[in-house]
Structures are given as C-alpha cells and as structure tokens.
C-alpha cells in the first residue's frame, strides 16, 4: 500500500501491481525489457505531496531499483478526480534491469490517463490499466487508488474502470457510463503495395468515445468496427497505414518501424467520425506518439487479452484477439508469434 501524508493525514492511497515494458539499445541491437514493480518499492517522500493550497495538486511518486520512479499526478473538480498525468523515469545505468545498455542516462516518459473516479469514492480496476508512453508501456493491475481522501482510509464507495465491465451498483456515475455493445467481431485486414503485402492483421476493434451531448451531459459510448466496413491502406518504407471506414466514420491505424531495433508498432491512430447526438457532431482525434502492438519485424504480434490503447482523453481504442504483422510479411502468412506480456501470465 502506497500512502502520501501531510501532517499525519493521508491524502492519497494506492495499491496495485505494476510492470513497465520498454526497449533500450545495446551493442547487439535493441533489447525489450519487462520490469515488475518489486515489493521493496516505496513512496518517495520528497517527490510526493498532498498539494499546496491554491498552488498545486496532489502527487504520488513511487521509487524502486536504482532510481526508477513512477509518478501519478492528480487533479479534481467538484464531482470527480483523476490521474491527470503519469510519469515513468528509468535509469539505464541500472545493470540489473538494463544489462549492457549503451546509454547510462535517465529517461522520463509521460502520458495522460483515463484513471478517474467520483470524489469520495475509490477507483477500482481489477483488469489491466495500460498507459502508453513514447518508449514505455506501463501496466497497472488490481488497482485501488484514491486521492483527496476524507479520513485516511479508502472510502466505502467505488468507481470501477470501464474494462472491468458494469459496476456492482446499477446507478450511473457522472459522467454517464459507457454504453457498451457486445464484443466486436474479429475482422481480417490485408494491405498490399508495389512490393507485396505490408500489413496482415486479424483483430476485433472497438472505439470508446467520450463526448459532450447536446444536453451538455458527458457520455462515454463504445462503437464496434464491423467486418463490413471498407478497408484500404498504404505501404511505405517507414510507415504502414490501415484505413477502415464507413459512411459515418474513418479510422486510420499507422504502424511505424524502429529501424535500429527492427521493431514495428502501432504509432498513430486517427479518427474522424460523425456523432449525431453530440454538441459538436464532427469528432476528430489523432495521436501519433503511441507505442502499442509491438513486435520484431518479420514476426507477428499476438494478444488474446483485451487491450485498451489510450489515444486521448476522448478516445480509447479497444483491441480484442489481435494478431498483426507490419512491413515484412512473407507468403501472405503470419510469421513467428510474439505474445503480449499479459497472455503469458
């Protein structure tokens, strides 16, 4: 249990297990490392705070190993609080976790998150919370988090993460709960260029969109991508795109490649969509600094576990039963499989 206190009063409590997936350079090329938050991890007192009146918000910094830290910065309004920003700092001079690293520098990566809960209730998420940063994927599991605490203990009530499914209570939190359809159907995608197939994918996609309705209420809705949607794409040396569209929506997935490490990954998501009941019916979002669905070029990335790719505060891309291979696809068939971390557990 991680606690942040001020004058003996606890303002943040958090309990979770965490792992950090990242890549680093060695003389023999790129290495992928998956670091677990050890039992010895503790709150960094001078990096954590209950916030200063009228000046700053509460933050929790957890330190472990040789100078690695995970920081959660909180903010609130009248009815809800959230982890506005998450930072992960890692020290490549830690030979235990980064053997043979060429660089010995300290790197800090950050991302916004969709961790939010009602004031005076704890945030609860049994499922994986995946936060995608530039070169790191942070995975929190079995998380109970609460900031702006009232009496130095977790509150009775809880706000559940959307990936845990419906909350035990039937009453909706504010904003409205996601209107989740059934799981999307697996679709098969194939992008071909002048030099043959550059993308092969089998996956079920779902868009989780948060928007303001005409009545000024915030709603989160899930939209399934149908196998009937039209798919197209393009093959480039450093960029492979897959576009899936229908009359109301155009979703573009952009896969990038790190030439030095021979890794491909989902680098960008762009969505243009019409939401008839929205205050602003034209919904456009893009993020080109993702690092998801990552595997070695020539191999395929596979994950049976549902993945939530946080694109922005307004959009999360949920991927089910995915197998994808980009840039180098031989004989129109998937290559060797690289399974996601969570399938291995």
């Amino acid at each position: 249990l991680f606690e942040v206190k001020n004058n003996g009063t606890t303002c943040i409590m958090a309990s979770f297990s965490a792992s950090f997936l990242t890549t680093y350079e060695t003389a023999n090329g790129s290495q992928i490392v998956n670091i677990s938050l050890p039992a010895s991890a503790e709150v960094l007192k001078n990096g954590s705070s209950c916030g200063k009146e009228n000046v700053s918000d509460p933050s929790l910094t957890i330190t472990f190993g040789r100078g690695h830290t995970l920081t959660l910065n909180f903010t609130r309004n009248a009815t809800r609080y959230s982890v506005q920003h998450m930072y992960f700092t890692y020290n490549l001079s830690d030979t235990e976790h980064f053997p043979n690293a060429i660089s010995k520098e300290i790197y800090t990566m950050d991302s916004t998150t969709d961790i939010r809960a009602d004031i005076d209730k704890k945030y609860r998420c049994v499922s994986d919370i995946r936060v995608y940063m530039k070169n790191v994927t942070v995975v929190l599991r079995d998380a109970t988090i609460q900031a702006y605490l009232s009496n130095s203990s977790f509150s009775r009530g809880e706000t559940h993460c959307t990936q845990d499914g419906p909350s035990p209570t039937t009453g909706p939190p504010s904003p409205s709960p996601p209107l989740v359809p059934t799981n999307p159907t697996v679709s098969k995608y194939n992008v071909t260029g002048n030099n043959g197939t550059c993308l092969l994918a089998s996956m079920a996609l779902q868009l989780n969109i948060t928007y303001l309705k005409k009545d000024n209420k915030t709603v989160t809705r899930a939209f399934n991508i149908s196998p009937n949607d039209t798919s197209s794409g393009s093959c480039g040396i450093n960029l492979v795109t897959l576009k899936v569209e229908n009359k109301n929506r155009a979703l573009e997935l952009q896969f990038g490649m790190n030439a030095s490490s021979s890794l491909f990954f989902l680098q960008g998501v762009r969505l243009n969509m019409t939401l008839p009941d929205a205050l602003v019916p034209t919904f456009s979002i893009s993020n080109h600094s993702l690092k998801a669905l990552q595997a070695t070029v020539g191999n395929s990335y596979k994950c049976n576990t549902e993945e939530h790719i946080f694109v922005s505060k307004m959009l999360s891309l949920n991927v089910f039963s995915v197998q994808v291979q980009a840039f180098k696809v031989d004989s129109d068939r998937f290559g060797s499989v690289e399974e996601c971390v969570q399938d291995g557990n």
Epitope: E53, N54, R76, N77, A78, T79, D118, I119, D120, Y148, S150, N151, S155, R156, G157, T169, T170, G171, P172, P173, S174
Partner: antibody, heavy 118, light 106 residues
Framework: QVQLQQSGAELVKPGASVKMSCKAS????????IHWVKKSPGQGLEWIGA????????PYSQKFKDKATLTADKSSSTTYMQLSRLTSEDSAVYYC???????????WGQGTLVSVSA | DIQMTQSPPSLSASLGGKVTITCKAS??????MAWYQDKPGKGPRLLIH???TLQPGIPSRFSGSGSGRDYSFSISNLEPEDIATYYC????????FGGGTKLEIK
C-alpha cells in the same frame, strides 16, 4: 471550527438580479465544495448547485442551471451565488453548505432571506 | 438528475410512539443517503449519513436503513422536540433532496 457566514437579507424587485455571499473560515477553503440549498415553504429543501473553489468547477441541478451562477474568490475564501430574472417563486431562504467529505451536508450557513416583491 | 420520492408528505403521531418515513431513489444510490431535521427559523440539521450512521450527539431514537433504491428513517419514543420537517438527501450522484415529511404530534 468550520464557519460559514452569509450576507444579509435582500428585498428585490421582479426581473432583477441578486448576488449573495458566503465567507468560509476554520478550514482550507480550496479543499471542499461549497453547496447552495434553497428552502421555501412550497418546495422544501432543494439543492441548487455546488462549486469547487480550487478551480471554479460548478455543477448545477437541472432546475437551477439557468437561474443561479456560482463563483468563488480564493483570496477572500468567499463563495457567491447570483440569481437572475427573479420572480416571486424565488422568494426563499438560501443556505450555503459545506459537505464533510462523504458525510453529506454537515455545516450550514445561517441563511440569506431573499424576498421578491414589486 | 436522480429523483427522490419521499412519503408520506405529512404524518401525525402520538408522543412515545414511532414513525417511519421512506424515500425511493430513481436509481441505485449505493447507500449514499442522509436524513435531515428542519425546524422553522433554524438551519437544517444532519441526523444520519451513509444510510444508518448517526451523527455525533443525535439520540439513538433516530435510525435509518435501506439499500439500492429504497430507504427508510424511523423515530421511536417520539418527543415534543421532534416536531419538524424531515428530508432525505442522496449524494451518490450529484445531490438531491426528497420532498419532505412534516411531522406533527397528535
């Protein structure tokens, strides 16, 4: 100890606006929401809205969102409620209230009586 | 907004007797229910929060129970000072008062 001191009674004409204040003391002003509640003989107690002084975020009851405007001044630890386009229906006692976290509305101001009359 | 339906609007009971007031929410409020006593010329007074937890200094003659959408509030051994209007308040999702129950002594 927590104290909420409200401004004095107001006699106003129909169609006019009124702005009342609520000065908080005895706690860190930006840590808690301040709520406003209407008490009238016909309707009983009604929640109007709340304001989080830390950033001015203010959710309103559907019934009052076009009637009331809540603001807060951090420097003086004071919250304000302005009521517009007043009618006789708005004649009531208005309370500012502080919740004790999840212990509902624990601290009440002494109330401001608003009388709307031509 | 969540709607709260409080009943009865008024009731009359004898000293030493017992009364029960009910509140029904338009959706599950997860036991985030409070009860208030309101007397003329005074500010409302919090009696019970979290459905059944008595505020410090409130006599045990007052009690509350319920879950989901249905909640009740009781006063036993009625005393003259209990003459007041009683309100329920949900604070699970924003805040909503019930319509009130005016208690009179026969």
């Amino acid at each position: 100890q927590v104290q909420l001191q409200q401004s004095g009674a107001e006699l106003v004409k129909p169609g006019a606006s009124v702005k009342m204040s609520c000065k908080a003391s005895g706690y860190i002003f930006t840590n808690y929401n301040i709520h406003w509640v209407k008490k009238s003989p016909g309707q009983g107690l009604e929640w109007i809205g709340a304001i989080y002084p830390g950033n001015g975020d203010a959710p309103y009851s559907q019934k009052f969102k076009d009637k009331a405007t809540l603001t807060a001044d951090k420097s003086s630890s004071t919250t304000y409620m302005q009521l517009s386009r007043l009618t006789s229906e708005d004649s009531a006692v208005y309370y500012c209230v502080r919740a004790n976290w999840d212990v509902a509305f624990a601290y009440w101001g002494q109330g401001t009586l608003v009388s709307v009359s031509a | 907004d969540i709607q709260m339906t409080q009943s009865p609007p008024s009731l009359s009971a004898s000293l030493g007797g017992k009364v029960t007031i009910t509140c029904k929410a338009s959706q599950d409020i997860d036991r985030y229910m409070a009860w208030y006593q309101d007397k003329p010329g005074k500010g409302p007074r919090l009696l019970i929060h979290d459905t059944s937890t008595l505020q410090p200094g409130i006599p045990s003659r007052f009690s509350g129970s319920g879950s989901g959408r249905d909640y009740s509030f009781s006063i036993s051994n009625l005393e003259p000072e209990d003459i007041a209007t009683y309100y329920c308040l949900q604070y699970d999702n924003l805040w909503t008062f019930g319509g009130g129950t005016k208690l009179e002594i026969k």
